[in-house]
């Protein structure tokens, strides 16, 4: 017997927002939260907020981490509050870059 | 070069079952969304799903939830669409598309397949 | 369901001319929306996503505008090759839906 396929209950989740995309609010609302790290011009970049569509934060999520970049991606309210994303290299930090919060 | 090469024809009768494959080249097919589609003839687009290859989500629109069943074997970067209980109504042609992130759309699409339901 | 509405059904033109076809969103969609070309027996072709930005290797003479529910897609300049049908897509929410497509035809 074939399994039963799961019914999709498609929703939006209010996420933490952090960056430039985010103007002047500090939240979104979208069907996935995220948290990004990235490298640019020799800072740490850290950004949170929300994919909108389901299908773009899959894609984006399921790009794995690379040297210069990471986000990490959940499903649910405030889920990405306490989630910092990491680069793949545990404990050490790349030469000539600093911590910088894009606010 | 991306290509999605579609398999033949098919002509099947009522209430029979019908699997279709799409086959990858120049890409792996766990890196994108492999999405379906149908087009009856003189007829619109329908969108059926999609499936993630990677870890096998599925999205189904409703119209198709009891129809479709998209699988995949990444093995042999194939994926498939399989149509049950089939009636006049499924005779059309079944778009594969691949979904990417750089226009997050259907980018590349197969050259199709014909299905044919009459007994 | 995001019902999509798009005008006119068909449409002649001459060589040369411009053609403006329109996409209704029964809710807002963002800029969410892909308009695709498909000659017969041929799979749809991607000419334009996120309403307004051009796929790569179209030509410039097909352009997308809009935002939220209405939206427009325009050819300059037909050429021969144009004459095909054209359809708009929304991908924000599931189940993903098209337009009833616009079937352009030689004057």
């Known amino acids: 017997v074939e399994d039963e396929k799961p019914k999709v209950n498609q929703k939006l989740y209010m996420c933490v927002c952090e960056g430039l995309s985010c103007g002047n609010e500090d939240h979104c609302e979208g069907q996935q939260c995220f948290s990004s790290l990235s490298i640019n011009d020799g800072f740490h970049v850290y950004q949170k907020g929300c994919f909108q569509v389901y299908e773009q934060g899959k894609m984006t999520c399921k790009t794995p981490p690379s040297p210069g970049q990471a986000v990490e991606c959940c499903q649910g309210d405030w889920c990405n509050r306490n989630i910092t994303a990491q680069l793949p290299t545990k404990g050490k930090s790349f030469p000539g870059t600093q911590n910088f919060h894009l606010e | 070069e991306v290509q999605l090469q579609q398999s033949g024809a098919e002509l099947v009768r009522p209430g029979a079952s019908v699997r279709l494959s799409c086959t990858a080249s120049?890409?792996?097919?766990?890196?994108?969304?492999m999405h379906w589609v149908k087009q009856r003839p003189e007829q619109g687009l329908e969108w059926i799903g999609w499936?993630?290859?990677?870890?096998?989500?599925?999205r189904y629109a409703p119209n198709f939830q009891d129809k479709a069943t998209i699988t995949a074997v990444t093995s042999s970067n194939t994926a498939y669409l399989q149509l049950s209980s089939l009636t006049s109504e499924d005779s059309a042609i079944y778009y594969c598309?691949?979904?990417?992130?750089?226009?997050?759309?259907?980018?590349?699409w197969g050259q199709g397949t014909s299905v044919t339901v009459s007994s | 369901d995001i019902q999509m509405t798009q005008s006119p059904a068909s449409q002649s033109a001459s060589l040369g001319e411009s053609v403006t076809f329109t996409c209704l969103a029964s809710?807002?969609?963002?800029?969410?929306l892909a308009w695709y070309q498909q000659k017969p027996g041929k799979s749809p072709q991607l000419l334009i996503y996120a309403a307004t930005s051009l796929a790569d290797g179209v030509p410039s003479r097909f352009s997308g505008s809009g935002s939220g529910t209405k939206f427009s897609f325009k050819i300059s300049s037909l050429q021969a090759e144009d004459f095909a049908s054209y359809y708009c897509?929304?991908?924000?929410?599931?189940?993903?839906?098209f337009g009833g497509g616009t079937k352009l035809e030689i004057k």
């Open positions: 499936i993630d290859p990677e870890d096998g989500e599925t």
């Open positions: 897509q929304q991908l924000y929410w599931t189940p993903w839906t």
């Open positions: 598309a691949r979904y990417t992130s750089r226009y997050y759309t259907m980018e590349y």
């Open positions: 120049g890409f792996n097919i766990k890196d994108s969304l």
């Open positions: 809710q807002t969609i963002g800029t969410w």
